[in-house]
């Protein structure tokens, strides 16, 4: 598969985790591969075993320390290598000079909760998880609400262009079940991407009061 297309993509969660995916056309499913991380200015190095996630794709997480510890900074460069076993030896398949803060993907927001719900409105809050203090307020969010009879893909995206960990949903239908998700992205980084969507938060609007015009 030397001439096949391969891809090695890694993201830093801004604290103590680098998640990597390695894919290669024609590679065997039972191939044993690893990712090695060698920072240019740190005393530690780290390895993780790539595990199959699809036909020709493997993934692993480089755990650099305690979840909320700040293991890398904007000046760090980490040389990442994919090594695969060929017989008795390890063969280097790919190498990347990885700039952590150019390749960010944060953890999904957590602790979603309904702060206040009415017939047509719902106020929801959330928290960000394992996000670096370096960002200060330089984060943005996207949110979406699942209405009855629709899919997540059909849900319009609501953009919050600042670090605002709450939203007030309006023009909702009374006595109706909804679901809500949010995701986060730092403004920094050439290859930075959105976090995964949060776990959905289910909520129901209050019924319209009897005899009242809604």
């Amino acid at each position: 598969a030397v001439n096949g297309t391969s891809q090695f993509t890694c993201f830093y969660n801004s604290r103590a985790n680098i998640s990597c995916v390695w894919s290669q056309d024609g590679a065997l499913q039972d191939t044993s591969c690893q990712v090695h991380a060698w920072p240019d200015r740190r005393r530690w190095n780290q390895t993780c075993e790539l595990l199959p996630v699809s036909q020709a794709s493997w993934a692993c997480n480089l755990i650099l320390g305690a979840p909320d510890s700040q293991k890398l900074t904007t000046v760090d460069i980490v040389t990442l290598r994919v090594l695969c076993r060929e017989g008795v030896r390890w063969r280097v398949m790919a190498i990347q000079d990885f700039k952590p803060f150019e390749n960010l993907r944060l953890m999904a927001p957590i602790s979603l909760q309904v702060v206040h719900v009415e017939t047509h409105r719902c106020n929801i809050s959330w928290e960000i998880s394992q996000a670096s203090h370096y960002f200060e307020r330089h984060l943005e969010f996207e949110a979406r609400t699942l209405s009855p009879g629709h899919t997540w893909e059909e849900a319009p995206l609501l953009t919050l262009k600042q670090k605002q960990e709450w939203i007030c949903l309006e023009t909702l239908t009374p006595d109706t079940q909804y679901e809500f998700q949010v995701r986060v992205k730092p403004l920094q980084g050439e290859f930075t991407t959105w976090s995964p969507w949060s776990q959905p938060l289910a909520f129901r609007t209050k019924p319209a009061a009897l005899g009242k015009d809604t």
Epitope: A1, V2, N3, G4, T5, S6, Q7, F8, Q24, D40, I77, T79, R81, M93, A94, I95, Q96, D97, F191
Partner: nanobody
């Protein structure tokens, strides 16, 4: 866009040496990792060597390991391939290529390509 211009090819006797150069230019060039490939007449293009721009980490084809050395000069945006112990089977058109982030042995992983420089090794 990124422009890659190879130079340094020529005719050399078996056992001799050559140094190929690849100069990178263009507004889009941004510390891209670089590689060398070669294509002999009637054969597929094959990987020779590659280097990451920042750390200088290298990859080699088994057929050239110990004989060829890839290096780069950051100040000149240039990558070199020092070839020694040349063999007739090293005769080929040598291409320089740039990848966006990662060096591998697969030609499809490289985005930008030069026009090539001819290396001929006589026996």
């Amino acid at each position: 866009q990124v422009q890659l211009v190879e130079s340094g090819g020529g005719l050399v006797e078996a056992g001799g040496s050559l140094r190929l150069s690849c100069a990178a230019s263009g507004r889009a060039f941004n510390n891209f990792p670089m590689g060398w490939f070669r294509q002999a007449p009637g054969k597929e293009r094959e990987f020779v060597a590659a280097i990451t721009w920042i750390s200088g980490s290298t990859l080699y084809a088994d057929s050239v390991k110990g004989r060829f050395t890839i290096s780069r000069d950051k100040s000149k945006n240039t990558v070199y391939l020092q070839m020694s112990g040349l063999k007739p089977e090293d005769t080929a058109l040598y291409y320089c290529a740039a990848a966006l982030k990662t060096i591998t042995r697969g030609q499809h992983d490289y985005t930008y390509w030069g026009q090539g420089t001819q290396v001929t090794v006589s026996s």
